[in-house]
Amino acid sequence: DGCKDIFMKNEILSASQPFAFNCTFPPITSGEVSVTWYKNSSKIPVSKIIQSRIHQDETWILFLPMEWGDSGVYQCVIKGRDSCHRIHVNLTVFEKHWCDTSIGGLPNLSDEYKQILHLGKDDSLTCHLHFPKSCVLGPIKWYKDCNEIKGERFTVLETRLLVSNVSAEDRGNYACQAILTHSGKQYEVLNGITVSITERAGYGGSVPKIIYPKNHSIEVQLGTTLIVDCNVTDTKDNTNLRCWRVNNTLVDDYYDESKRIREGVETHVSFREHNLYTVNITFLEVKMEDYGLPFMCHAGVSTAYIILQLPAPDFR
């Protein structure tokens, strides 16, 4: 059928809660493409009816909720004008107790389930919640050893738990919980995270590679909405932070009042040897003051910027 096969690593998931997987492959899905999901080499595509427990939502496959029998290999076919790629995703579903972190002793857990805090530093844990726009996520609650976390050293900020002055006692088993609403129905999402503490300074030994942007300018009309992705490849065991900054300040902090420019939620795609991370920056409305300013994507020690510029006047 002329489609190129790409095999993703196994995803290990919890039964009885929602799960979504986005069929994105930046080199391919950046242009005009169609995406279709299939299960276990079936010729019949996954339903697009939003009332279906399993359905396709734009480029996503969405399980509301995941069930024991949903384990298997799912394919998403990405068709462009001149190309076709078939991405294979192996999903393994397991049962787990509400406050569990370890997934039945399964090895090779994704980095989302294993996170590192740096001793003596201010650091954070991330609750990885990857869902399409049709899913509305409520505030996140954090637990350690089955008890809700509280104390002045802990701050919940969107999908992160900020931990100030990390101590050795912060190691252990954490869980983050959110209520997801879709088509008027509510579901509980719960992710377990095993946290270890490292004394190593900085963020690991790997140097992430920023694929895009490439220190360039983008022509954009005044008043328009603009979304720019930062695509980063990094090792699977990395602990690098990825974010957008302007004037050496996180964009979410810099534009805290107006919220006109925001950082998106990070997503990633796992390959055998590395992870590909995407975190976007959204300009709800480009203003005059945005032109000529370097907006920096940071990934560990790596940086790359974009500069917005007004389109050249058209004298035709």
């Epitope: 787990k96 107790h97 972190t101 050893d145 089955c146 509280k150 104390g151 002045e152 101590s167 006692e169």
Partner: antibody, heavy 116, light 107 residues
Framework: QVQLVQSGAEVKKPGASVKVSCKAS????????MNWVRQAPGQGLEWMGM????????RYAQKFQGRVTMTVDKSTSTVYMELSSLRSEDTAVYYC?????????WGQGTLVTVSS | DIQMTQSPSSLSASVGDRVTITCRAS??????LNWLQQKPGKAPKRLIY???SLDPGVPSRFSGSRSGTDYTLTISSLQPEDFATYYC?????????FGQGTKVEIK
């Protein structure tokens, strides 16, 4: 390093109250729950309840509800467990145990003897 | 409340023996289970956290495992200092509950 130091042994009469203290050091006291566990002579371990020093939220085992009160003094990083209406079967060693990770550290124990 | 049924209540073994102690939970507790060791006149000491994570400084002859709601503490080769009482403790939901204890004695 983490240390939990408890107050000394007590002898009480039936009907009286006892207040045992547990002073914590070596970790962020207000970040983690503190548990109280007791052990009667020759018997097993029994969980009594816990308190979070950050906001003094308590959870008590049903068996001790109404008789036990756990309090905290943040200025001295000390947790207290008061048990009232003592009876002979309350004779036990009382332990505090920190849940930095679940029951990671234990105090040395305080022997409370209830005798007329 | 969650009941923890520990067996055996006591056992006699020799130095070098492999010893296995079991706890059964009356309902699902996931991996929220610790194993504690207590010697006479001393406070309990945690050996294993979250079913199978060995605490720092605890010899590798101790290990923990799980099958469903059955939890096992194994001492691969019993040493003289291992003669003590062992307790399991579930912390999945309060009230937290302990097993009745297993006294490991010298044969």
């Amino acid at each position: 390093q983490v240390q939990l130091v408890q107050s000394g042994a007590e002898v009480k009469k039936p009907g009286a109250s006892v207040k045992v203290s547990c002073k914590a050091s070596g970790y962020f006291f207000t970040s983690y729950w503190m548990n109280w566990v007791r052990q009667a002579p020759g018997q097993g371990l029994e969980w009594m309840g816990m308190i979070h020093p950050y906001d003094s939220e308590t959870r008590y085992a049903q068996k001790f509800q109404g008789r036990v009160t756990m309090t905290v003094d943040k200025s001295t990083s000390t947790v207290y467990m008061e048990l009232s209406s003592l009876r002979s079967e309350d004779t036990a060693v009382y332990y505090c145990a920190s849940s930095t990770t679940a029951f990671a550290y234990w105090g040395q124990g305080t022997l409370v003897t209830v005798s007329s | 409340d969650i009941q923890m049924t520990q067996s055996p209540s006591s056992l006699s073994a020799s130095v070098g023996d492999r010893v296995t102690i079991t706890c059964r939970a009356s309902q699902d507790i996931g991996n929220a289970l610790n194993w504690l060791q207590q010697k006479p006149g001393k406070a309990p000491k945690r050996l294993i956290y979250a079913t199978s994570s060995l605490d720092p400084g605890v010899p590798s002859r101790f290990s923990g495992s799980r099958s469903g709601t059955d939890y096992t503490l194994t001492i691969s080769s019993l040493q003289p200092e291992d003669f003590a009482t062992y307790y399991c403790l579930q912390y999945a939901s309060s009230p937290y509950t302990f097993g009745q204890g297993t006294k490991v004695e010298i044969k």
